[in-house]
């Protein structure tokens, strides 16, 4: 598999700043991701009035959002950090499809979506690096996502609405686990 | 909108020092990688490294890791490399390019600056 | 180091014409491939980002595909603004690195 950027072993810095260790570098663009997905949550609430919703209704949606659970080990309690990286790295390829249909909901934060989109992107290359066991990494199938997307645009206003803010509230959640799991390996 | 303005054209004597500065106008600095690309007369491009502006992490091609030096100035919003010993093998033009967060296409690019390396 | 090539240095077409520019990264660089046009003034613009996404500006005739190693961009209708030189770039692996890149020449 392709090196990721900054994780070459040819690579070096300039003598002024140490290159950051893999598990920094990790961190931080989950940290840049998150600041990116406040803002665009920010432009989504300030649109409608999903934000104000219970959780309970919004709870009632048939997207299949990945989530962590306990059989993941990415929590403290059965912790497994193997079982853990396939899982943060499966659930962010999952996510790829939801974040690309965010791409035409923002009108002010469009660069921002894209930027979300991308790093993401960079994110699963220093992951996939870090994993030993890259077979048990299953990809999503292209046709699957392909119309999960095509049915997605096809909603009304208010349930793109609904899948907007639910996309971003769900991939928040779980980069949030993935960092706290992170910061254990 | 996005702006990258790079500072003017320079005429160096070979040994001397070359700073080149990349202002940088219409989106927050410290959010996205900020890289470097050299491209000799009539050749292609060629990436000499790129430097976070939020905590100025580099990270340089091998090639030019004694060469260039890349630094930021966040209260100016404004990156600058630096190389040393410039030989005519520097004449070039040099271009700075942000990305798309922390990403590695080059989303927007400045207008280059002509180094000519000249006794 | 990535090698990216691009057979064609320079590529003949007529104002109106379908135009394809190949590029091949020497490993598997997956789909982290983008495109950019350089204008004879040295100014440069993304066109094309991972492979396909069109760049926010860029005119929908031009479109990219491919995936692995093999990697190419469409010009559907060729117009007197798109005559510039075209590079590719793998974003899989540092150091970056660039295609030689092909320039569109009018017949």
């Known amino acids: 598999a392709p090196v990721p950027p900054g994780e070459d072993s040819k690579d070096v810095a300039a003598p002024h700043r140490q290159p950051l260790t893999s598990s920094e570098r990790i961190d931080k663009q989950i940290r840049y991701i998150l600041d990116g997905i406040s803002a665009l949550r920010k432009e989504t609430c300030n649109k409608s009035n999903m934000c104000e919703s219970s959780k309970e209704a919004l709870a009632e949606n048939n997207l299949n959002l990945p989530k962590m659970a306990e059989k993941d080990g990415c929590f403290q309690s059965g912790f497994n950090e193997e079982t853990c990286l396939v899982k943060i790295i499966t659930g962010l390829l999952e996510f790829e499809v939801y974040l690309e249909y965010l791409q035409n909901r923002f009108e002010s934060s469009e660069e921002q979506a894209r930027a979300v989109q991308m790093s993401t992107k960079v994110l699963i290359q220093f992951l996939q690096k870090k994993a030993k066991n890259l077979d048990a990494i299953t990809t999503p199938d292209p046709t699957t996502n392909a119309s999960l997307l095509t049915k997605l645009q096809a909603q009304n206003q208010w349930l793109q609405d609904m899948t907007t803010h639910l996309i971003l509230r769900s991939f928040k959640e779980f980069l949030q686990s993935s960092l706290r799991a992170l910061r254990q390996m | 909108q996005v702006q990258l303005q790079q500072s003017g054209p320079q005429l160096v004597r070979p040994g001397a020092s070359v700073k080149i500065s990349c202002k940088a106008s219409?989106?927050?600095?410290?959010?996205?990688?900020m890289h470097w690309v050299k491209q000799r007369p009539g050749q292609g491009l060629e990436w000499i490294g790129m430097i976070d502006p939020s905590d100025t992490e580099t990270r340089l091609n091998q090639k030019f890791k004694d060469k260039a030096t890349l630094t930021v100035d966040e209260s100016s919003s404004t990156a600058h490399m630096q190389f040393k010993r410039p030989t005519s093998e520097d004449s070039a033009v040099y271009y700075c390019?942000?990305?798309?967060?922390?990403?590695?296409?080059?989303?927007?690019w400045g207008q280059g600056t002509l180094v000519t390396v000249s006794a | 180091d990535i090698q990216m090539s691009q057979t064609s240095s320079s590529l003949p077409a007529s104002l109106g014409d379908r135009v394809t520019i190949s590029c091949k990264a020497s490993?598997?660089?997956?789909?982290?491939l983008n495109w950019y046009q350089q204008k004879p003034d040295g100014t440069v613009k993304l066109l094309i980002y991972?492979?396909?996404r069109l760049h926010s500006g860029v005119p929908s005739r031009f479109s990219g595909s491919g995936s692995g190693t093999d990697f190419s961009l469409t010009i559907s209708n060729l117009e007197q603004e798109d005559i510039a030189t075209y590079f590719c770039?793998?974003?899989?692996?540092?150091?970056?690195?660039f295609g030689a890149g092909t320039k569109l020449e009018l017949k």
């Open positions: 219409g989106y927050s600095f410290n959010r996205s990688w």
């Open positions: 390019a942000r990305a798309y967060g922390f990403s590695i296409e080059f989303a927007y």
């Open positions: 770039q793998q974003g899989a692996t540092l150091p970056l690195t």
């Open positions: 991972y492979t396909s």
């Open positions: 490993q598997d660089i997956r789909s982290y």
